[in-house]
Every structure is written in C-alpha cells, then in structure tokens.
C-alpha cells in the first residue's frame, strides 16, 4: 500500500516518501522508485534555514548603506544576513529594512533607555525632584540641586524642565 503520511523530515510525492533537503541545500530532484532525493548546496549569497523541498535558495538580505544599514552578522548557507543600523540610527521594523535617527527626549523628559541599532530611545517624564532642560538622546533626568547641602536656601522652585535656584539665607540682624 502506498503511504498516506511520511516520517519527520520526509514529504509525500507520487505515493513515495522522499527525504527533505537539509538546511543549506535546495531540491534538485524528487526521489523516485529508483532514486533518493537529490539536493545541492545553496550558493555563497543564498540560504535555506529549514528542512525543505525548495527548488531555489533564498537570497541573503542586503544591508543597504544608503538606508543606514550595516551587517551585524554575515549570512551562511543556513542563515540569513542580519542587518543593524549605523550609529545614531535604529531599525524601523523587526525585519530591519531601513533606519531612522534616534529620537531625542525633549526638555522635561529624560532618557530611560539609550537607543541601540534595533531599538529607539525610550524617554520618561522627569518625576518631582528631577529635571531635564535639554533635548537629548543620552541625558537622564538630573536631580534638582540640594540647596541645603550648600548652606543655601531655595529662591526659586524647580520644575521638570528647570533646576531650583539657590540663594543665601536671610541673615538675622
């Protein structure tokens, strides 16, 4: 009786269970009653990352420098090339097909997590007691100056965008 299902790493064709091609190889010829599946290695610029019956290997991803991309990991016959973004840029999507500049955190916000090649800057509002008066992709919220430790008093309260202003204490006459 011809099989209706095949083992793992096999496929059914013409009532025959044929071996799939291993990762890094493409199908040249299905198995027959007389022959085993024939597979060939992918060429240098190509890959297949699964057991397969593909007659064409996939082209390695091209990390286009015009889009701000650079190679993070060179592709092999079994893996695709991994692109990342040049410094100061990050990927627009998980597949990293293009890059955009990291965003800066506006005054009143500080950097919670510095951007990487694959993720944008994460900003957070400066909580009470902290401020940021610059637009920056690196600076965290800074704590207000402690006037007391300088033997000074607060002359102007701080905000999330400004530091406190300290001044001398009023002297008793």
């Amino acid at each position: 009786e011809p099989p209706t299902a095949c083992r793992e790493k096999q496929y059914l064709i013409n009532s025959q269970c044929c071996s799939l091609c291993q990762p890094g190889q493409k199908l040249v010829s299905d198995c027959t009653e007389f022959t085993e599946t024939e597979c060939l290695p992918c060429s240098e610029s190509e890959f297949l990352d699964t057991w397969n019956r593909e007659t064409r290997c996939h082209q390695h991803k091209y990390c286009d420098p015009n889009l701000g991309l650079q190679v993070q990991q060179k592709g092999t016959s079994e893996t695709d090339t991994i692109c990342t973004c040049e410094e100061g840029l990050h990927c627009t999507s998980e597949s990293c097909e293009s890059c955009v500049p990291h965003r800066s955190c506006l005054p009143g916000f500080g950097v919670k997590q510095i951007a990487t090649g694959v993720s944008d800057t994460i900003c957070e509002p400066c909580p009470v007691g902290f401020f940021s008066n610059v637009s920056s992709a690196f600076e965290k919220c800074r704590p207000w100056t402690s006037c007391e430790t300088k033997d000074l008093v607060v002359q102007q309260a701080g905000t999330n965008k400004t530091d406190v202003v300290c001044g001398p204490q009023d002297r008793q006459r």
């Epitope: 040249v28 027959t32 007389f34 024939e38």
Partner: antibody, heavy 115, light 112 residues
C-alpha cells in the same frame, strides 16, 4: 498519458557521430530525469547516464562519459544523446527512460555502426 | 561497479506452475536512507523493457499479483506463482543504489 517517443533508426560509419532524440509528453518535462540505456544485440542492458532537465545536471557511467553527451531542449520537451567516435560495438538499441510515479520507456532507436 | 548475477540463464516452465529467478549483487544494495534499490523487469521479444517490481518487493501499478519479489542485502528473488503464456520473455534485475547503475544478464523464461 506519459509518452517518450524516440527518433528513427540510424546507420553510421565508424568514427562518425550520431545524435538521438527522445520527445516527452503527458507530464511536466523538467520534473523528472531522463536516462539512457543501451541494449546490444542479444545482450543485456547497460546504463549510460541521465540528465536533469531542470538544471542540465548529468550523471554518467564512466564507461560512456568521454563519448556520450546528454542535453535537453526544454522548449520542446526533448532530450538528446550524442555519441561520438562511433565504433562497431556501439551497434545497439538505445532507450530513453523516465521514472517517478511509474517507469516509462521510449520505443528504442536502433543504431547500426558499420563500414 | 556492482556486478549483478542472475540464475538460471534459461528457465523452461510449465503453464500454471510456479517459477523462481535469483539475483545476487557483489555488494549490499542497502542505501544509507534505509531503502534497497533492487528492481525487476520483463522484456518480451521485440519490445521495450517493462518494470514489474521496485525496491525489492513493490509491484508497479497494473502488474499482476502473481509476481512477487523478496530478499535483502545481496540476495534477491523474483517469483511467479502460476506462469501464464504472456509471461514468456527475458527477466532482468537491476540496482540503482550505486553509480553506475547495473543490470543482471537476464533470465529467459520459456514454456516447456
């Protein structure tokens, strides 16, 4: 239905060349190898080699490798075998065959090599 | 090359009686994938060969069930349970495990 139709009988002189054809129909030509087999008069069979029409890849019996050339023309679903530097021992019936989901044979081409 | 030896060379049989042909290979025909690529076919006078059995024991579609194949490794047998007049011809074994593919010399089945 699957059919392999071979070219007609040939008579050649020693040292000449001959090109036999095998026209396939009834299936997707590039999906299956075409093989060639020799049967000399009153003899058994000898495997010459095969060609994959998908990419032109060949495999050969070393005995025939230096004198046999296998080619295909996918536009007309035809396989060819050219045999060069013919000698009297090449006198035989030559079959083309295809397997995968059944085995199919051409009707054979008779080649006579004689001075 | 793998040498395929068939016996007998000639087999005179009585209609309705069984017949058996042996085929031995000079090395094992067990492929690394677990299959054994030993095949049998028949050639009637003046005709192209016609495959009967593939991979030792699998009958091709349309082949009568009076034909059966068995064996493993290097020893193989084709049996005809009850010979009919249309079974007359030469029977070949062949192997496609090793390149070059090779054939047995043939066994001529004729009616007594």
């Amino acid at each position: 239905q699957v059919q392999l139709v071979q070219s007609g009988a040939e008579v050649k002189k020693p040292g000449a060349s001959v090109k036999l054809s095998c026209k396939a129909s009834g299936y997707t030509f590039i999906s299956y190898y075409i093989y060639w087999v020799k049967q000399a008069p009153g003899q058994g069979l000898e495997w010459i080699g095969g060609i994959n029409p998908r990419n032109g890849g060949t495999n050969f019996n070393e005995k025939f490798k230096s004198r046999a050339t296998l080619t295909v023309d996918t536009s007309i679903s035809t396989a060819y075998m050219e045999l060069s530097r013919l000698r009297s021992e090449d006198t035989a019936v030559y079959y083309c065959t295809r397997h995968g989901n059944g085995v199919y044979w051409g009707q054979g081409t008779t080649l006579t090599v004689s001075s | 090359d793998v040498v395929m030896t068939q016996s007998p060379l000639s087999l005179p049989v009585t209609l309705g009686q069984p017949a058996s042909i042996s085929c031995r290979s000079s090395q094992s025909l067990l492929h690394s994938n677990g299959n054994t690529y030993l095949h049998w076919y028949q050639q009637r006078p003046g005709q192209s060969p016609n495959h009967l059995i593939y991979q030792v024991s699998n009958r091709f579609s349309g082949v009568p069930d009076r034909f059966s194949g068995s064996g493993s490794g290097t020893d193989f047998t084709l049996k005809i349970s009850r010979v009919e007049a249309e079974d007359v011809g030469v029977y070949f074994c062949s192997q496609t495990t090793h390149v070059p593919w090779t054939f047995g010399g043939g066994t001529k089945v004729e009616i007594k």
